[in-house]
């Protein structure tokens, strides 16, 4: 069920309409639910989830990650810088979410829902951001070649890539959720 359409909202017609922050919060939690379902399938069909961090670190994926310089941590917190980082990071994740689309059998719809919900989240956040000029959009040509390269990997590497994308995306969303609630 997409955010804002669950039974709780139906049962409470007197509830105030969701604020922008509440909508974003709910959207992130909805995407995290989807990731959780996808991770279940991934972990059930391969042993990637038990792999050590060291082995995972060898993979050379350039997945977005929150760092102190991004202004999302308590020390050096900067709302606008942080918002730009969150949006930029989500835009960078889009190519990896596209890669996930053909990686699931029983959770195919869930993978699509995560991808589409992320697009909606980006739109919500862009409305909140003041400095849209600072947001760099990934180059489509670079994304296309990256996608081709990822899809050409052997089965083991594709499983590893899937696991890494889900784990990193979950962590990025959690860091974003934490920062957005401080705003």
């Amino acid at each position: 069920v997409p955010p804002g359409e669950d039974s709780k909202d139906v049962a409470a017609p007197h509830r105030q309409p969701l604020t922008s922050s509440e909508r974003i919060d709910k959207q992130i939690r909805y995407i995290l639910d989807g990731i959780s379902a996808l991770r279940k399938e991934t972990c059930n069909k391969s042993n990637m989830c038990e792999s050590s961090k060291e082995a995972l670190a060898e993979n050379n994926l350039n997945l977005p990650k929150m760092a102190e310089k991004d202004g999302c941590f308590q020390s050096g917190f900067n709302e606008e810088t942080c918002l730009v980082k969150i949006i930029t990071g989500l835009l960078e994740f889009e190519v990896y979410l596209e890669y996930l689309q053909n990686r699931f059998e029983s959770s195919e719809e869930q993978a699509r829902a995560v991808q589409m919900s992320t697009k909606v989240l980006i739109q919500f956040l862009q409305k909140k951001a003041k400095n849209l000029d600072a947001i760099t959009t990934p180059d489509p040509t670079t994304n296309a070649s990256l996608l081709t390269k990822l899809q050409a990997q052997n089965q083991w590497l594709q499983d590893m890539t899937t696991h890494l994308i889900l784990r990193s995306f979950k962590e990025f969303l959690q860091s974003s959720l934490r920062a957005l609630r401080q705003m």
Epitope: Q74, K170, R178
Partner: antibody, heavy 119, light 106 residues
Framework: QVTLKESGPTLVKPTQTLTLTCSFS??????????VGWVRQPPGKALEWLAF???????YYSPSLESRLTITKDTSKNQVVLTMTNMDPVDTATYYC??????????????WGQGTLVT | DIQMTQSPSSLSAFVGDGVTMTCWAS??????LNWYHQRPGEAPELLVF???NLQIGVPSRFRGSGSETYFTLTINSLQPEDSGTYFC?????????FGGGTKLEI
Amino acid sequence: QVTLKESGPTLVKPTQTLTLTCSFSGFSLSTSGVGVGWVRQPPGKALEWLAFIFWDDDKYYSPSLESRLTITKDTSKNQVVLTMTNMDPVDTATYYCARSADDYLYYSFDTWGQGTLVT
Amino acid sequence: DIQMTQSPSSLSAFVGDGVTMTCWASQSINDYLNWYHQRPGEAPELLVFAASNLQIGVPSRFRGSGSETYFTLTINSLQPEDSGTYFCQHGHSFPLTFGGGTKLEI
């Protein structure tokens, strides 16, 4: 099984620095969504949140005590350390460390240490 | 900072009774509200997280509800072991704050 245990001095003189260690097992502080917090409770009074450290080393402090507190983690040793400078008799309390671990960051403390009384 | 206010500060009831205690937040905290139970000389124990989700192992006679600024914890069919102090805590953002507690005597 998740467990946490606080250790440190039971008696501290005024103006001294208190150093408390939280040793834990059954979870990793490098897993996203996981954090460890410190909470204190003066005798017969309510709970007071002090500090919190996340898996990615982001740290938060109680505004009223921020200048006196430092929280650090050693992931390899499964330990979190809280230091509190310039101790005063009003800081007499039972000090607890507690774990928070959920996907949506509700900051709910699902497992607590037994607590250590500091006078 | 978000302030948490609990009411009543104390109450007494008999085994088998039902009681309700409330917790108010000074601003909207969505459903980021947790409830704890503490017996004398013991560490607090998480009962309810996210306003209405029972922690694993907590009896179903406990029920949390509410959203935004108003929350309640209801205990049906009170048992002797339910005595102690109940604290609410918001988990919306930092700084985290606890309510002053509701002391329950059975």
